[in-house]
Amino acid sequence: KSSNEATNITPKHNMKAFLDELKAENIKKFLYNFTQIPHLAGTEQNFQLAKQIQSQWKEFGLDSVELAHYDVLLSYPNKTHPNYISIINEDGNEIFNTSLFEPPPPGYENVSDIVPPFSAFSPQGMPEGDLVYVNYARTEDFFKLERDMKINCSGKIVIARYGKVFRGNKVKNAQLAGAKGVILYSDPADYFAPGVKSYPDGWNLPGGGVQRGNILNLNGAGDPLTPGYPANEYAYRRGIAEAVGLPSIPVHPIGYYDAQKLLEKMGGSAPPDSSWRGSLKVPYNVGPGFTGNFSTQKVKMHIHSTNEVTRIYNVIGTLRGAVEPDRYVILGGHRDSWVFGGIDPQSGAAVVHEIVRSFGTLKKEGWRPRRTILFASWDAEEFGLLGSTEWAEENSRLLQERGVAYINADSSIEGNYTLRVDCTPLMYSLVHNLTKELKSPDEGFEGKSLYESWTKKSPSPEFSGMPRISKLGSGNDFEVFFQRLGIASGRARYTKNWETNKFSGYPLYHSVYETYELVEKFYDPMFKYHLTVAQVRGGMVFELANSIVLPFDCRDYAVVLRKYADKIYSISMKHPQEMKTYSVSFDSLFSAVKNFTEIASKFSERLQDFDKSNPIVLRMMNDQLMFLERAFIDPLGLPDRPFYRHVIYAPSSHNKYAGESFPGIYDALFDIESKVDPSKAWGEVKRQIYVAAFTVQAAAETLSEVA
């Protein structure tokens, strides 16, 4: 049978039928259903939701829907011994205490099991000492403090504002600086957009609102006790002392009302420049310690959270492919939330639910995709991407042989301005072509394509007339698929105007105020942006699963490889003398990129010309496309980060959320001027150039004619 016979309907009609079946009203209904109570990972409520989703996906028509459970390390506050921070006087009396919980939003006063704000996986402890304000606690902030200002954080409690980088990186930096505790807070400069009211009157963060979140530095390991292997019934677990990525000092998050009480008394050094000042009416003095009258007062943390091995549940749904059932296209997003999950994750989960329903409707009419589609509702994403990582560890052999693509589906919105896409270069053309076929939901772009509004509002910095598409970093469930397994991955959501809104993420991120009402009243009353995101995510899955030739363009990888090689070369050339002294050359890398470009070009020509009616040749060409991403995987991984194995992309060592290109070379060059042994340091740069050049060349050769 040809693929069209196997799927019963012509491909064009398939896609239209699928997209036409997606309804904004259903997404709205699903979002409401998913957000009425908290669904914290490891709780009974989240298990019940898993079973509900399993049941509904079966009703929608999937071939099978199973729960996959794992027993992983999670972290919870002590219910009878709350976490808080105090200002204490010289007698040890607590003269101020931070809040024990957030003021509940209207209509949710009687909801039980709202977990109070906490930093997941913080160790227990009651450190007391002087405070040091460390800005965003980025690598460069600690450089400024230690190298320029000569301020020693050793034995101090540091207070850092949320934003710019992943909170786990902040904690790691504070630990390395010798701090004995970390206080994280949301500054209005980052979480209060001018001219907008705070919740419940608008989408800004109120003073009592607090961002929860994990503070791990897992580097892709998954469950801290079972790195590399699934946390199943017969798992061997490490002792807590050997667990991966746990912080060693107490950490606690607070809102800006409480932060003001701590920061208003700060003395010591003035802030080094205006970039260290937020929007509170406080001096933003760095410290250490409080000013004159208050110099005898100290800060004391009271942290009593516990780490517990707890059962989590993924929901895995299968829609079997008619022609290539052994090729998997995966759509996955998490289900667990910190509290109600109005945006994160349920705005994404509601979209996945509607995509499943639409696919199910087509299947009930006799249609099947060419390739198998797997749908996943991941658990424990908020605790370190645990559900997705454990499932991928359990199924790694299948995935590395059969995985075509992974499309992530966390929050559908973080604003309502324009589309935001991060993906492998292999998917650039797919995304461009798809968005040209979709209608823009934006005001002022009626009758225009999504591609047009997106390109106008978020232009590519390199190519005129094209939209910006970003590198994949981490901080979400695509990590294991892309960074560890080398499966082509992408994500899409609606975002804010980054030009005018310079706050980090969205203001109510991971707070109790992330409710259904937040979305319905302020972000997307008509659910038109949710529908657009459903069309983009669903459309990508549809094309990946149903197109006869995989919709990957290897030439786009060639273009970015050249760009990344130029960039890393220019970073290295900031040290011309050392490059000469240690004979550092990038010739091998540029040569490999040139070869990749030529071979990719020839492959693309062959792709146009080959006989698509020959199933063996078709399968061969598709396999070359599928395995190209895999070819960028180094089985040895990156230095000290064995689960980050992609040579072209990795999460930044300084910010998990951001993607870094040629990360091995980048990290070897980072701060190289401060290394005690320059010869060894530049030797490592040379080794990393060698690894990168070899990998690019090896990947290129997978696209050569097979014989």
């Epitope: 024990l100 003021p103 939003p105 705070s198 009157d201 009416k281």
Partner: antibody, heavy 126, light 110 residues
Framework: EVQLVESGGGVVQPGRSLRLSCAAS????????MHWVRQAPGKGLEWVAV????????YYADSVKGRFTISRDNSKNTLYLQMNSLRAEDTAVYYC???????????????????WGQGTTVTVSS | QAVLTQPPSASGTPGQRVTISCSGS????????VYWYQLLPGTAPKLLIY???QRPSGVPDRFSGSKSGTSASLAISGLRSEDEADYYC???????????FGTGTKLTVL
């Protein structure tokens, strides 16, 4: 309708105790700081005490420190003022008041009071 | 306990504009928002002005507040007979970790 209703006032001898209650309705009590304010006969308003929305912080006027205790029961939407070692100068109308919250700004001005009860009279006399 | 200083009385004829002053220090008015309350005879205090110069809904725009340094003032334009009441300013006092009221001003509409 947002409402605060005080109760528990009365005549009491010096040195004795009294507990005032303030029942709140029509708003999310758990989300607001609450104050007690008093007005002695023929005098002006005097702030007495404040408690944060979660009960984690309590502050008192010097004139009542060590004698009065402010508390709240969020499950009952009720604010309390336990008054011990009462003195003649504690004679006043006692008001409970809700801390004002302004959603258009982010400065924590320890906002004033936007909703007041009708007051309950406490008379300390031998 | 520190208090904010107000004139004991003020007066005006209907339609006139009157101003009530409130003087404090750097630890109260100087570093915190000022609030104004109206006490009509036999009723509970009513919030008139918050955050120095903001009016709650339902308060006529005849009432306006301002703050400069360690002083604040309440202006009432188009004076009406129902404005006859006691007026109190108030602010948080950082040195007390508490709240202070003004001495109060009795406004008479002549």
């Amino acid at each position: 309708e947002v409402q605060l209703v005080e109760s528990g006032g009365g005549v009491v001898q010096p040195g004795r105790s009294l507990r005032l209650s303030c029942a709140a309705s029509g708003f999310t009590f758990t989300s607001y700081g609450m104050h007690w304010v008093r007005q002695a006969p023929g005098k002006g308003l005097e702030w007495v005490a404040v408690i944060s929305y979660d009960g984690s912080n309590k502050y008192y006027a010097d004139s009542v420190k060590g004698r009065f205790t402010i508390s709240r029961d969020n499950s009952k939407n009720t604010l309390y003022l336990q008054m011990n070692s009462l003195r003649a100068e504690d004679t006043a109308v006692y008001y409970c008041a809700r801390e004002h919250y302004d959603s258009s700004g982010y400065y924590h001005g320890y906002y004033g009071m936007d909703v007041w009860g009708q007051g309950t009279t406490v008379t300390v006399s031998s | 306990q520190a208090v904010l200083t107000q004139p004991p009385s003020a007066s005006g004829t209907p339609g006139q504009r009157v101003t009530i002053s409130c003087s404090g220090s750097s630890s109260n008015i100087g570093s915190n928002y000022v609030y104004w309350y109206q006490l009509l005879p036999g009723t509970a205090p009513k919030l008139l002005i918050y955050s120095n110069n903001q009016r709650p809904s339902g308060v006529p725009d005849r009432f306006s507040g301002s703050k400069s340094g360690t002083s604040a003032s309440l202006a009432i334009s188009g004076l009406r007979s129902e404005d006859e009441a006691d007026y109190y300013c108030a602010a948080r006092d950082d040195s007390l970790s508490g709240y202070v009221f003004g001495t109060g001003t009795k406004l008479t509409v002549l």
